[in-house]
């Protein structure tokens, strides 16, 4: 009876999410493998988040709006492990917008989700950021490694969206 009611609850939750995400990919989690964590298909998952790489070339503002429509934000990178996971799926000859910007050009970088900007957990390429005119951050492959660079916000780039996993 308990299992039945849990299944009914899950199905109703799935139906609720289905209006936003036509398909979800779920895995069993938790110590009793009773919880399901889901990401929209074909998003990838890492720890408690889902990631989507958009190959549509758009400005930073339009890229963030695009993520927002999908219930996400441009990616906020919190650890080196997270960055290493993300970059596995990126193309080395492309650049991708991050959810990091300096809208006033004061070198006060801010994440889209208001996560505090921690200078000790940043992955700027050597010599970057280098221009207060360039107020948005990308991740790209340079000098044999992935890192961040400041660029003009209105120049179209690919982008990475991030959202919290859906638990049912």
């Amino acid at each position: 009876n308990f299992m039945y009611s849990k299944t009914v609850k899950r199905l109703s939750k799935l139906q609720e999410y289905q209006q936003y995400y036509p398909s979800l990919t779920c895995v069993m989690e938790g110590k009793d493998m009773e919880d399901w964590s889901c990401c929209p298909t074909p998003w990838t998952s890492f720890q408690s988040s889902c990631y989507f790489i958009s190959t549509v070339m758009q400005s930073w503002t339009k890229s963030q709006n695009n993520c927002s429509v999908m219930g996400a934000d441009l990616v906020v990178i919190n650890t080196k492990e997270e960055q290493d996971f993300i970059t596995q799926n990126l193309k080395i000859n492309s650049a991708y917008f991050l959810g990091l910007s300096d809208p006033k050009g004061w070198r006060h970088w801010q994440w889209v989700d208001q996560t505090p900007y921690n200078k000790n957990v940043t992955f700027w390429h050597s010599g970057e950021p280098n221009s207060p005119d360039e107020r948005c951050a990308i991740i790209n492959f340079r000098s044999e490694e992935w890192g961040w660079n400041d660029v003009h916000c209105h120049v179209p780039q690919k982008s990475i969206c991030k959202m919290k996993k859906i638990y049912i």
Epitope: S59, W60, T61, K62, S131, D133, E134, H152, H154, P156
Partner: antibody, heavy 121, light 111 residues
Framework: EVQLLESGGGLVQPGGSLRLSCAAS????????MSWVRQAPGKGLEWVAT????????YYPDSVKGRFTISRDNSKNTLYLQMNSLRAEDTAVYYC??????????????WGQGTTVTVSS | DIVMTQSPDSLAVSLGERATINCKAS??????????VNWYQQKPGQPPKLLIY???NLESGVPDRFSGSGSGTDFTLTISSLQAEDVAVYYC?????????FGGGTKVEIK
């Protein structure tokens, strides 16, 4: 006072090349992003190229990509536009302009007087 | 590309009267409360001059008879009391996304 003086325009045959220069004074050139904008005779304005302050990032519309190259020499306070494979539709007055960011966008706040490029056989 | 459509193509207004120019973007050029539309004035034989940035901010040194308004896709430049020196072509421009694009221009003349 900000001054921008373009030079290098002239008459060139289709398929030919030309290099425009823009001499800047009255501001710290090396800290400014710069752009070129053109205006065909009796027509509107068209953005042609942008280069960031350090010269390491350049941007172009599809209409000139692969044919035009923007560059700068910060030691000489000079902006350049190398134009190759010129076509009749590149005939225009070419203006250089300073770029000023505005949050996530920008404005072109100071403009030179322009130099005329005519592509004709 | 974002297309900027200006109307009318030309406008004849009496001295001291109001002149209104419209500009429509093919998609929204707003983000986080700011609109990325600028207005320029070009007098015959001269380069363009920046009048308004961010849809409604008056550039330093520009007379306050010029004003800008609008958001999303619809923007307006207003000259509250036309002066003889305002005879020019006016252009709107979006800077939200490359390629930057300009409207076709509106020629303002004295009636």
């Amino acid at each position: 006072e900000v001054q921008l003086l373009e030079s290098g325009g002239g008459l060139v045959q289709p398929g030919g090349s030309l290099r425009l220069s823009c001499a800047a004074s009255g501001f710290t050139f090396s800290t400014y992003t710069m752009s070129w904008v053109r205006q065909a005779p009796g027509k509107g304005l068209e953005w042609v190229a942008t280069i960031n302050s350090g010269g390491d990032n350049t941007y172009y519309p599809d209409s000139v990509k692969g044919r035009f190259t923007i560059s700068r020499d910060n030691s000489k306070n000079t902006l350049y536009l190398q134009m190759n494979s010129l076509r009749a539709e590149d005939t225009a007055v070419y203006y250089c302009a300073t770029y000023r960011p505005y949050y996530y966008g920008s404005v072109l706040d100071y403009w030179g007087q322009g130099t005329t490029v005519t592509v004709s056989s | 590309d974002i297309v900027m459509t200006q109307s009318p193509d030309s406008l004849a207004v009496s001295l001291g009267e109001r002149a209104t120019i419209n500009c429509k973007a093919s998609q929204s050029v707003d983000y986080d409360g700011n609109s990325y539309v600028n207005w320029y004035q070009q007098k015959p034989g001269q380069p363009p001059k920046l009048l308004i940035y961010g849809a409604s901010n008056l550039e330093s040194g520009v007379p306050d008879r010029f004003s800008g308004s609008g958001s999303g896709t619809d923007f307006t430049l207003t000259i509250s009391s036309l002066q003889a020196e305002d005879v020019a072509v006016y252009y709107c421009q979006q800077s939200d996304e490359d390629p930057w694009t300009f409207g076709g221009g509106t020629k303002v003349e004295i009636k």
